[in-house]
């Protein structure tokens, strides 16, 4: 168990734990104090004791010992009184820290006393050697517990220069692969530096005497170190490995290192000392094996094999850990170690080896673990696990602390939990105690909640309630108990309505550049704070201040100016503080394809066959399959910026061989097309020019026509530049009279025409036009028939007669003309006709002529749209390409027809039952007028009760209708007549009902002079005449509101003038009809000094 921080008020004891200790190896130098450190924590306070070499050691009883009097320390210092005192205290120390819960133990501390270093007295004889031979100058420094540094110097304290020939070994000896006379010195001194004592001692100087020789003999390498052919080494895992090979020979050998058993780990290997030393950092298992050094010179080689075995000091696989336990639990301490050789593991309890403990202990040791079952407070202890092999020792202290603690609920009482229907609520009840308390949940009735399978408990005391329902709202009680006590808390649960998206966004496919609207509707619990947000591909979307890309409002997301990058998943997130629901829709943005990214030409050798291969990378399809690729070309020389399609290939194709034309400067581009249209074109290809060739086509539309009587102009449609097949093209024109079989005349021209002069009128010619360029001629051209120039026709069409079809149409017929007199191709006939006037009277107006063109194969025409009862003049002419020939003339008349409609029919109301009709005669009589027909019927009777009158006087302009119903509206129809019958009608609707009602003065106004006023109005069309009174009433105090006598006025008269008014006076004008007040207006007369005349043309009554 672990005591939670919130579990307060219980002062738990602590077993001893070593917090600081001296290193495992302690070297003491003559002038140093000895400090042995051992510190530990624990409650109650810790007591310390020491052993030396396994025997109880009491620091306080030793001379010169200072013990630190601090509660957590068992450390002590020994101060010496002579240089040799430390020897007395050498040994293996161990510290034990104890309190009532157990004993912790330090590791073994090996104390070693190092004396002052001295070189043993020796007489160093001179070393004599012949030039070229090898030599070893020994150093043999005194032994030292700490690593020391060796330097070779001369008496001037100058380092002996080392190189491939002269090397100091790891052992301190100075090796010469071969000596030179320059090595002859008497002061080779080996210096040993002891960092611990901060002292340097030196050996007696060595005198090296080199005898010169005239002939140095070459010799193959021999190893000076190691001397044998192989050696075995143990390397420690994690430590560096140093291998050394020093060779002699002449010339000086070079050293190489090999690893026959595998690759040399280049990242961890360094070569030092001119390759004589191999250092391998951080040795691992994989470094086990053979390493070989090879010394070589021009005479041969020597070798040494190092067989390296990698071993390891003990190291942890699983270190035992201290733990608290409650009564009844099982304690298990794992102690798993590894090393090479495999370490031996021993257990101690409170510092005592388990072998020395009584046999009735309840622990058992099983596969490297110490196990205690059903622990009780009396089983509290500190255990030690120790592992050792020949390379070292590993120690771990771990306690088993069995505590008894009362049950306590660490979750606050009376907490309120809120969750939504259908979700899972978690009611917390974190309890702690030792033994671990049991936890149970009860409802308000004190009944366990676990009868409902929706309620499920967790080991940590939490109660889960899944598929929440509204009636789960209420109070719940958590009860925690162990063998010491029991405690309870209450939890309140409120179940809210779950948030629901009632209408989520819908997946859609939209076009690039358009906008899309996603909508989202959700329902929320009314007591919760609702929120609707939008996400795009998992990112929160917001309206950006400086951009109108997104518009978010009222559950709507509008994305403007859609681009392909907007494609993705959009979701509406409806949330409250309790729940979140999300509804997702997919947006696909479609549009025309992207550009073809890359275009390559290949097989350029095919250009000689007017072909080339074009390949391209596929374009982005933008969610609509590419249907086809359009391959276009441009010729920058002949038509820059103009692109021509060479063809389309299916959308699954990305290359094609193109058929080209000779001598075109082709630059290609490719455009992808899908159902939305073409995309951007690819980058343009390189320009390639096809070799020249003779033309493959001749001009088309070859014609021969004269533009004068004595010539023939041969024309043709020039070849398009892409058919020239060369830089220029010319035309070989050939001609000869048709049917002569004589020689062809020919001319080569650059223009698309040729004029042949001095021809007879209208002679047929055979014509050929052939394309020609620098490479040759086009194919054999086809023969076309052309004609020399035409003359005006001399043929006069002979009229056969005119047939009157009706009053406005005639059929004209003539005989075909003699073609010989046409002097060209008969193109047709021109028929011209015009009206000379009515048969009633001849007009002197401007004559308008009409024309009809009749094809050459037709000899009749119908002239329609003529005016009845009129005289016409007619001309017919044959015409060819040159013009029209002489005309044949004729006159004819059209018979009478029915007249046009009468003009301007007016209805004037005479009384409630009578109307006066006024009209004007028709503009087109189309014959002799014989009178009028008047018809009328009430409107609401659907045409029944039609009455008709024949008015037989053609000069009649009015007609009075009586006995009309004042309550009906009528439809009036008036037609003029000739002997051919009645013509078109003029129609009006009206009656006395609408017109005789309340008088309407329409647009009434009043103007004034100095002593008069004119009242005027516009009588309404058809309004029945009536009489009314006009009364002028002066305003103002001095006038006393005097009125003039009322005047009787007729509606039809349109105006009325009132005389005898006062100058500069305001008047009110009142209009009465049958004593009913109908209208009121105001007017003011002018001041004096003006002419008193009413405006001209005003009637007075």
């Amino acid at each position: 168990i672990q005591i939670p921080e919130e579990y307060e008020g219980h002062h738990v004891m602590e077993p001893p734990v070593i917090t600081e200790q001296s290193p495992r190896r302690l070297v003491v130098f003559p002038t140093d104090d000895i400090s042995l450190k051992c510190e530990a924590s624990g409650k109650p306070e810790v007591q310390f004791r020491w052993t030396r070499d396994g025997v109880h050691f009491k620091p306080k009883e030793e001379l010169g010992v200072t013990v630190y009097q601090s509660p957590h320390s068992g450390s002590f210092t020994i101060t010496g009184n002579n240089s040799n005192f430390a020897q007395r205290f050498q040994g293996i120390y161990r510290c034990f820290a104890s309190n009532k819960l157990g004993t912790a133990m330090s590791h073994e501390i090996r104390l070693m006393a190092e004396g002052a270093p001295k070189w043993p007295k020796e007489t160093v004889k001179p070393v004599e050697v012949e030039e070229g031979e090898s030599v070893v100058l020994p150093c043999n420094p005194p032994p030292s517990a700490e690593p020391l540094r060796i330097y070779w110097m001369n008496s001037k304290i100058l380092h002996i220069k080392q190189d491939e020939r002269v090397t100091m070994g790891q052992n301190g000896n100075l090796y010469f692969a071969n000596v030179l006379t320059s090595d002859n010195h008497s002061d080779y001194i080996c210096h040993a530096h002891f960092p611990g004592t901060r002292t340097i001692i030196q050996k007696e100087p060595i005198d090296l005497r080199v005898k010169a020789t005239n002939s140095m003999i070459d010799r193959k390498p021999r190893l000076l170190f190691p001397t044998n052919s192989s050696s075995h080494l143990v390397a420690l895992q994690g430590q560096p490995l140093v291998l050394e090979c020093i060779a002699e020979g002449f010339p000086t050998p070079t050293i190489k290192w090999l690893r026959p058993s595998g690759p040399m780990p280049a990242d961890r290997v360094t070569y030092q000392n001119h390759n004589k030393t191999l250092q391998l950092l951080k040795v691992g298992e994989e470094d086990d094996g053979e390493y070989r050094c090879l010394a070589e010179n021009s005479l041969g080689s020597a070798r040494h094999a190092y067989y390296v075995t990698v071993e390891a000091a003990p190291y942890w696989l699983h270190k035992p850990q201290s733990h608290l336990y409650g009564p009844g639990e099982t304690a298990r301490l794992d102690c798993q170690v590894q090393g090479r050789p495999q370490p031996e593991v021993t257990w101690r309890i409170n510092g005592i080896p388990v072998e020395e403990l009584a046999k009735d202990q309840k622990y058992r040791i099983q596969r490297g673990a110490l196990i205690l079952s059903n622990v009780q407070p009396s089983d509290t202890m500190v255990t030690q696990c120790e592992a050792r092999n020949r390379h070292g020792l590993l120690l771990a202290n771990a306690y088993i602390y069995v505590v008894q603690l009362p049950a306590k609920i660490l979750t606050a009482d009376n907490q309120t939990y809120m969750a939504v229907q259908g979700s899972t609520a978690y009611l917390l009840c974190k309890a702690f105690g030792a033994p671990v308390p049991s936890v149970q949940w009860l409802d308000e009735d004190g009944t366990t909640v676990l009868q409902d399978e929706r309620f499920f408990p967790y080991a940590n005391g939490t109660l889960g309630i899944r598929d929440l329902q509204a009636n789960d709202t209420g109070r719940y009680f958590c009860l925690a108990a162990n063998d010491q006590n029991n405690v309870t808390i209450m939890a309140n649960l409120k179940v809210k309505d779950a948030t629901q998206i009632t209408q989520g966004p819908r997946s859609t496919i939209e076009k690039k550049g358009s906008r899309v609207t996603f909508t989202c509707q959700a329902s929320f619990d009314p007591s919760l704070q609702p929120s609707i947000t939008w996400r795009g591909d998992g990112r929160d979307l917001q309206e950006l201040g400086d951009s109108d890309k997104y518009f978010i409002e009222d559950g709507r997301l509008v994305i403007h100016s859609l681009d392909y990058s907007d494609q993705g998943n959009y979701s509406c997130v409806a949330s409250t503080e309790l729940d979140v629901v999300e509804s997702r829709a997919q947006l696909l943005v479609v549009g025309s394809p992207g550009p073809v990214p890359r275009l390559v030409l290949s097989d350029l050798h095919l250009l000689t066959q007017s072909q080339v291969r074009v390949s391209w990378s596929p374009a982005e399809d933008h969610n609509a399959p590419i249907e086809k690729y359009d391959i276009e070309f441009e010729d920058k020389e002949m038509a820059p910026e103009k692109w021509y399609s060479l063809g389309k290939v299916p959308g699954n194709q990305t290359s094609t061989t193109l058929k080209l034309s000779p001598y075109v400067h082709y630059t290609f581009r490719v455009t992808a097309i899908n159902k939305y249209g073409p995309g951007e074109p690819s980058p343009v290809s390189e320009t390639v020019v096809t070799p020249e060739a003779a033309p493959e086509k001749n001009p088309v539309d070859v014609k021969g026509e004269g533009n004068e009587t004595t010539n023939m102009v041969i024309t043709w449609k020039p070849l398009r530049w892409m058919d020239w097949n060369a830089p220029q093209v010319q035309y070989r024109v050939q001609w000869r009279p048709q049917g002569t079989r004589g020689p062809w005349q020919e001319q080569i021209v650059s223009d698309p025409f040729l004029v042949v002069s001095n021809t007879s009128t209208f002679v047929p010619y055979e014509i050929k036009v052939q394309a020609v360029n620098s490479q040759g001629k086009g194919p054999e051209p086809q023969v076309t028939i052309g004609y020399s120039g035409e003359d005006y026709p001399q043929a006069i069409p002979e009229l056969e007669g005119i047939e009157i079809l009706n009053s406005s149409a005639v059929l004209v017929k003539w005989r075909p003309v003699d073609l010989a007199q046409v002097k060209g191709h008969l193109r047709g006939y021109n028929v011209t006709y015009w009206r000379e006037g009515s048969q009633r009277k001849h007009s002197k107006r401007h004559i308008h002529k009409d024309h009809v063109v009749v094809p050459a194969n037709t000899t009749s025409v119908i002239l329609s749209g003529l005016r009845p009862y009129s005289s016409y003049h007619l001309e017919v002419q044959a015409f060819n390409g040159r013009g029209s020939g002489p005309a044949s003339e004729f006159t004819f008349s059209t018979p009478e027809g029915v007249p046009g409609h009468p003009e301007a029919l007016h209805l004037e109301c005479q009384s409630n039952t009578s109307l006066l009709l006024r009209w004007q005669p028709p503009l087109s009589h189309n014959g002799v007028l014989t009178g009028y027909v008047l018809s009328y019927h009430p409107l609401d009777e659907g045409g029944k009760g039609q009455l008709s009158f024949n008015l037989r006087d053609p000069e009649l302009r009015t007609h009075n209708l009586t006995d009309l119903s004042p309550h009906l509206r009528y439809r009036f129809q008036l037609q003029a007549t000739t002997k051919e019958g009645p013509g078109e009608a003029i129609v009006r609707e009206g009656g006395t009902m609408a017109l005789s009602g309340i008088s309407d003065f329409g647009n009434i106004s009043a103007t004034a002079g100095e002593n008069y006023s004119v009242v005027s109005w516009v009588p309404k069309e058809g309004q029945c005449n009536f009489r009314f009174h006009i009364l002028f009433k002066a305003l103002g105090e001095e006038k006393g509101g005097a009125s003039l006598s009322p005047q009787y006025v007729s509606y039809n008269q349109s105006s009325y003038t009132q005389w005898d008014l006062q100058p500069d006076t305001d008047y009110e004008i009142h209009l009465f009809k049958e004593r009913m007040f109908r209208h009121q207006m105001a007017v003011k007369t002018n001041g004096t000094g003006r002419v008193r005349l009413p405006p001209a043309g005003f009637a007075t009554e």
């Epitope: 030409l601 250009l607 000689t608 920058k636 400067h665 980058p683 320009t687 070799p691």
Partner: antibody, heavy 119, light 107 residues
Framework: QVQLVQSGAEVKKPGSSVKVSCKAS????????IQWVRQAPGQGLEWIGY????????DYAQKFQGRVTLTADESTSTAYMELSSLRSEDTAVYYC????????????WGQGTTVTVSS | DIQMTQSPSSLSASVGDRVTITCRAS??????VAWYQQKPGKVPKLLIY???TLHSGVPSRFSGSGSGTDFTLTISSLQPEDVATYYC?????????FGGGTKVEIK
């Protein structure tokens, strides 16, 4: 008359980059593609790639893909070739050449720029 | 890539001699072959294209022939100013490739 003038010789360290310029005159720069070719000491000619100065579209030999960048500046009628991650075997004379109008041939050449790569 | 193999790699001939250089393509290139001349210390110069078409300004003693995979450059009468290295180039397909060159010297 048509001229292509290249920048001066360069000495570079392995791993670095070099940028060679080629200034064109005497013709409309954007009408003709610029090709780049190199010649190692005592060796033959090796095509590097081309650029279209009017659209800046370029393509390279597979061997140089990812290491070479061809650019052009229409305002100064200058083409550039940048070669990165230089190695000793990139030591060569680098030529720019105008592509003949109509075929991938080299009708006008720059005087060449010697690039030496050495540590 | 299309390999272009030139032979010989060098030759020595006397002034007035007829000199022939051959070039072999590793695949059919039709007649899409050009020849260049590079004088010592100078830039290459276009001589022939479409295997046999003389570039403007090139003396008529130079001629080319061949199609498919085998091509020949001929100098009908060697002149001192013809001392140079001659390269063939295929332009049928990218990458454009050159032959290794033929060095022509005067004896």
């Amino acid at each position: 008359q048509v001229q292509l003038v290249q920048s001066g010789a360069e000495v570079k360290k392995p791993g670095s980059s070099v940028k060679v310029s080629c200034k064109a005159s005497g013709y409309t720069f954007t009408n003709y593609w610029i090709q780049w070719v190199r010649q190692a000491p005592g060796q033959g000619l090796e095509w590097i790639g081309y650029i279209n100065p009017s659209t800046y579209y370029s393509d390279y030999a597979q061997k140089f893909q990812g290491r070479v960048t061809l650019t052009a500046d229409e305002s100064t009628s200058t083409a550039y070739m940048e070669l990165s991650s230089l190695r000793s075997e990139d030591t060569a004379v680098y030529y720019c050449a105008r592509r003949q109008f109509g075929l991938p041939l080299f009708d006008y050449w720059g005087q060449g720029t010697t690039v030496t790569v050495s540590s | 890539d299309i390999q272009m193999t030139q032979s010989p790699s060098s030759l020595s001939a006397s002034v007035g001699d007829r000199v022939t250089i051959t070039c072999r393509a590793s695949q059919d290139v039709g007649t899409a072959v050009a020849w260049y001349q590079q004088k010592p210390g100078k830039v290459p110069k276009l001589l022939i294209y479409w295997a046999s078409t003389l570039h403007s300004g090139v003396p008529s003693r130079f001629s080319g022939s061949g199609s498919g995979t085998d091509f020949t450059l001929t100098i009908s009468s060697l002149q001192p100013e013809d001392v140079a290295t001659y390269y063939c180039q295929q332009y049928s397909n990218y990458p454009l490739t050159f032959g290794g060159g033929t060095k022509v010297e005067i004896k």
